[in-house]
């Protein structure tokens, strides 16, 4: 169902000293700036709904500009316990205390807050990102080293009056920016406690939050300029699938990848892509300003509604998955990467997908909802779309049940 | 400016293995993925395969499976092609280049000679 | 795989001439044809890409047509820092082939 409800206290329509307070671009992430101890530190950090942990970088590393120095804060106090994050590529590690912590381009509020200051990385910080730290916005369930370990936003809720919720408005550029662009480039917003109206057009659409760990949610139909994938909806959710702002493409199961890259490369046959273009390998170029936006299929998401039998859908235009490119030796033209991927841990909803919505993360009612974004890039001919209701049976089926590891089974 | 620089000219022993490097500079590093290239006189240039740097997914051309290994560090912007039970064969230049539309970048060409 | 054949080992040219390089692909390719230019002793430089578009740099003496199955890299005003062997390439699908390359000399 749209927002049509009376208001609740803390989430009145404008949040000015929050607008425009992300920087960054899809393929590096969007960050934004935060305080750390006393006397402040001032901190970059990426604003990411796929994890759980505040971590920022505590040591000299070459990719860093900065970092927290928690011998310089008075407030800092140490836990005394280490944490170790693995990525399938990558890792970090450091040690867990926790120190003053606010936004300033967010609520006028300071917490004391868990944080990681990390020690010791690989393949995590990228160089020319901007950023030096993650905020984890996620829940407790997949914070590390355990969920006993209090994610940033619970900190946050819990010690001030700030309402349990918080939207992103994330701004994809529809071209490349160079360095100095990016830094001087608004990347968009995070609202935290509230909905800004000024962000959005049209209405807002609720999905259920299937499980509190990730944000996960439950797909339960994928069309292709119209036409339905027809897959058992069971393929879309293998093994979830969630809403991630710290990914860049729009990831999908194996299955689902090669059927929608089928029926996305019988939509544009009008032009021959190399192979290594739907693998994101090789880019396309077209002379500048001539990009074919119009041979390349919209790509539509229905999500499960609030309501029993009742879906919505949401709608993506090739400006959000042909994601732009700066290379030198083709500089004269506008290349672009193909960036929807494959993956092996379900479907990712990242910022291809979340650069066309204003996507509002009600934890107080476990949901998630999804509006066309007033920032979105688009053509005079097509633009991005939340639309319902629509009809969808037996939608619970959709959702994937992951075998549990009953561990008192295992020997010890 | 882009630049990719291989690794000094390696002389092996037949049955040894060898690891040359490329090291990228100028770019964002995990943008673009690095393929590596064997050219032997009268032989032409031949694509052994290439890495993303951004997940280290791998993808060999079927001839040089068994032969070559791909891996990247980001920290140091490095990819590395590991060669192994070196034959004459193997002997040739060997080339790092850079994706972007086919291969717009060229590393500066790494001697492999094997040689008892 | 597909078969890049450049049926011409090498071509004779003057200085200030027009000569043409050409490359038959063994199945359709689309436009996703590169050309490189090598030098002995020298890594290949990047000529032309999508058979017609030319890299940054590149003079516009090099000029590259052809989609399908054909392909041909036209150098006019031959110069003498042209003198060097030519490759085709295609990148429209895995594994990445190339020509057997063209060697251009002087008359």
């Known amino acids: 169902e749209t927002d049509e409800e009376p208001e609740e206290p803390g989430r009145r329509g404008s949040f000015v000293e929050m607008v425009d307070n992300l920087r960054g671009k899809s393929g590096q992430g969007y960050y934004v700036e935060m305080t750390v101890g006393s006397p402040p530190q001032t901190l970059n950090i990426l604003v990411d709904t796929g994890s759980s942990n505040f971590a920022v970088g505590a040591a000299p590393h070459p990719f860093l500009h900065r970092y927290y120095q928690r011998q310089l804060s008075s407030t800092y106090r140490d836990l005394r316990k280490g944490v170790y994050v693995p990525y399938t590529q990558g890792k970090w590690e450091g040690e867990l205390g926790t120190d003053l912590v606010s936004i300033p381009h967010g609520p006028n509020v300071t917490v004391r807050a868990n944080i990681a200051a990390i020690t010791e990385s690989d393949k995590f910080f990228i160089n020319g990102s901007n950023w030096e730290g993650i905020l984890g916005l996620a829940y407790a369930e997949i914070a590390r080293p355990d969920d006993s370990l209090e994610p940033f936003f619970d900190s946050l809720v819990k010690q001030t009056h700030v309402p349990n919720l918080f939207s992103l408005q994330l701004c994809g550029a529809g071209f490349p920016l160079n360095q100095s662009e990016v830094l001087a480039s608004v990347g968009g917003s995070m609202i935290i406690g509230g909905i800004d109206h000024s962000l959005y057009t049209g209405s807002l659409w609720y999905t259920p939050i299937r499980r509190e760990w990730y944000y996960e949610v439950i797909i339960v139909r994928v069309e292709i300029n119209g036409q339905d994938l027809k897959m058992d909806c069971k393929e879309y959710n293998y093994d979830k699938s969630i809403v991630d702002s710290g990914t860049t493409n729009l990831r999908l199961p194996k299955k689902v990848f090669e059927a929608a890259v089928k029926s996305i490369k019988a939509a544009s046959s009008t032009e021959k892509f190399p192979d290594g273009f739907w693998l994101g390998e090789q880019l396309v170029c077209w002379q500048a300003g001539t990009t074919p936006w119009n041979i390349f299929p919209v790509i539509s998401l229905y999500l499960m509604g609030e309501v029993t039998n009742q879906s919505f859908r949401i709608t993506i235009l090739p400006q959000q998955y042909l994601r732009p490119v700066e290379d030198v030796a083709t500089s004269q033209d506008d290349c672009y990467k193909f960036a929807i991927s494959q993956s092996s841990t379900g479907t990712v909803m990242g910022a291809v997908i979340m650069e066309g919505f204003y996507v509002v993360f009600d934890r107080a009612r476990k949901r998630i909802g999804f509006a066309v974004s007033a920032c979105h890039v688009h053509d005079e001919f097509r633009t991005a779309a939340v639309e319902g209701p629509f009809v969808t049976l037996d939608m619970e089926d959709c959702g994937y049940n992951i075998p549990q590891t009953d561990e008192s089974t295992l020997m010890t | 400016e882009v630049q990719l620089q291989q690794s000094g000219p390696e002389l092996v022993k037949p049955g040894a293995s060898v690891k040359l490097s490329c090291k990228a500079s100028g770019y964002t590093f995990t943008n673009f993925w690095i393929h590596w290239l064997k050219q032997r006189p009268g032989q032409g240039l031949e694509w052994i395969g290439m890495i993303d740097p951004s997940d280290s997914y791998t993808k060999y051309n079927q001839k040089f499976k068994a032969k070559a290994t791909l891996t990247v560090d980001t920290s140091s912007s490095t990819t590395y092609m590991h060669l192994s039970s070196l034959t004459s064969e193997d002997s040739a230049v060997y080339y790092c280049a850079r994706s972007g539309v086919a291969f717009p970048y060229w590393g500066q060409r790494t001697l492999v000679t094997v040689s008892a | 795989d597909i078969q890049m054949t450049q049926s011409q080992k090498f071509m004779s040219t003057s200085i200030g001439d027009r000569v043409s390089v050409t490359c038959k692909a063994s199945q359709n390719v689309g436009t996703n044809v590169a050309w490189y230019q090598q030098k002995p002793g020298q890594s290949p430089k990047s000529l032309i890409y999508s058979a017609s578009h030319w890299y940054s740099g590149v003079p516009d003496r090099f000029t590259g047509s052809g989609s399908g199955t054909d392909f041909t890299l036209t150098i006019s005003n031959v110069q003498s820092e042209d003198l060097a062997e030519y490759f085709c390439?295609?990148?429209?699908?895995?594994?990445?082939?190339f020509g057997g390359g063209t060697k251009l000399e002087i008359k």
């Open positions: 390439q295609q990148y429209n699908s895995y594994p990445y082939t």
